[in-house]
């Protein structure tokens, strides 16, 4: 369970792939589309508000039923819209929703080598946001394999300004 309804902290950042392609968001036909693309040099990167929440780790060894904490994150590129996992379609979508956010909007944050991050679905452990055919998709990762596969690695470039939604 998430340890509180409020995030412990928030930050504004641009999101790019391991290969430095930008994650961009475009309003099309009253819904948002997510793209993975090479940005022209003069084009500004899209910002995402990351809200970080603590979640108790279910215990397998300690007697008190919890075993430390995980860090969960929600990603919002524009007011009232959040990235959500669609596990049936293996897709990542932007949906307008009100708080409390659904579980599909929460991702376990994994720090990776070279200061990259990965986002694991709260609703489907072992499934990560990844890049497939220039789009974001949900990708199943075998834990026995190296989780460093490049298509689930992302770079966060923090934008140090007031951490509120951009409109």
């Amino acid at each position: 369970s998430i340890t509180g309804i409020s995030p412990i902290t928030e930050s504004l950042a641009s999101l790019s792939t391991y290969n430095d392609q930008s994650i961009t968001f475009a309003l099309e036909d009253e819904s948002y589309e997510i793209y993975v693309e090479d940005l022209k040099k003069d084009k500004k990167k899209d910002k995402v508000l990351l809200s970080y929440y603590e979640s108790q780790h279910p215990s397998s060894e300690s007697g008190d039923g919890v075993d430390g904490k995980m860090l969960m994150v929600t990603l919002s590129p524009t007011k009232d819209f959040w990235l959500q996992a669609n596990n049936k379609e293996h897709s990542v979508e932007l949906h307008k929703c009100e708080k409390p956010l659904p579980d599909q909007a929460f991702f376990v944050l994994h720090n990776r080598s070279f200061n990259c991050v990965s986002f694991e679905c709260k609703t489907d452990p072992g499934v990560f946001i990844g890049v497939k055919d220039n789009h974001l998709a949900l990708i199943k990762v075998d834990y026995s394999e190296n989780l460093g596969s490049e298509n689930i690695l992302f770079k966060l470039s923090e934008i140090l300004e007031h951490h509120h939604h951009h409109h």
């Epitope: 412990i8 902290t9 928030e10 930050s11 504004l12 970080y52 603590e54 780790h57 215990s59 397998s60 060894e61 300690s62 075993d67 430390g68 904490k69 995980m70 860090l71 376990v108 944050l109 994994h110 720090n111 990776r112 080598s113 200061n115 694991e120 834990y143 190296n146 989780l147 460093g148 923090e158 140090l160 951490h163």
Partner: antibody, heavy 122, light 107 residues
């Protein structure tokens, strides 16, 4: 109760080797990244090495690269630091530390062992 | 690498005082900063993480604030057991780096 207990420190000559161990209990060891942090006498703290869980990615401070090797045995709930080609400047108390968050280093270290002293001297 | 500079390096204070320790980062980040307390011959103890979140079991007289490059640890109503050395640590990016420490001594 979370416990981290280091062992294996001692007096060693320059160029010598030591293997430090850190026995962990009270949490699911395999789920958490673990680190070694050292503190030279009268000095501050320095992250020496870190071992992530998934994918097993490792970090080494530039000052120890090629000489120290971090490893873990999840079946024994134990973290190791193999120290080779030791130098006088490696003299320090070595602490093992548990990552606050299971999959992220953002929270720092929430539990530390009591430390084991490594003295490199002829 | 992000360098962390703590000030002052030492401070003399009395029981009941308010003590403020600052930590400056060589490059900015949002809030992934931790504060530790260390007593002679003991391991460091986590007090604050994510710049302002109080670690479980730590008294509420300890508080943290800041973002970007400037962070602060404040101890209100200093107690005898608070005389120790305090370290900040940036947990934003590898290598995770510590400040040089601030020793809080009895006046």
């Amino acid at each position: 109760e979370v416990q981290l207990v280091e062992s294996g420190g001692g007096l060693v000559q320059p160029g010598g080797s030591l293997r430090l161990s850190c026995a962990a209990s009270g949490f699911t060891f395999r789920s958490f990244a673990m680190s070694w942090v050292r503190q030279a006498p009268g000095k501050g703290l320095e992250l020496v090495s870190d071992l992530r869980t998934s994918g097993g990615s490792t970090y080494y401070a530039d000052s120890v690269k090629g000489r120290l090797t971090i490893s873990r045995d999840n079946s024994k709930n134990t973290l190791y630091l193999q120290m080779n080609s030791l130098r006088a400047e490696d003299t320090a108390v070595y602490y093992c530390a548990k990552s606050h968050y299971s999959t992220s280093w953002f929270g720092g270290f929430d539990y530390w062992g009591q430390g084991t002293l490594v003295t490199v001297s002829s | 690498d992000i360098q962390m500079t703590q000030s002052p390096s030492s401070v003399s204070a009395s029981v009941g005082d308010r003590v403020t320790i600052t930590c400056r980062a060589s490059q900015g980040f949002s809030s992934w900063l931790a504060w530790y307390q260390q007593k002679p011959g003991k391991a460091p103890k986590l007090l604050i993480y994510a710049a302002s979140s109080l670690q479980s079991g730590v008294p509420s007289r300890f508080s943290g604030s800041g973002s970007g490059t400037d962070f602060t640890l404040t101890i209100t109503n200093l107690q005898p057991e608070d005389f120790a050395t305090y370290y900040c640590q940036q947990a934003n990016s590898f290598p995770l780096t510590f400040g040089g420490g601030t020793k809080v001594e009895i006046k």
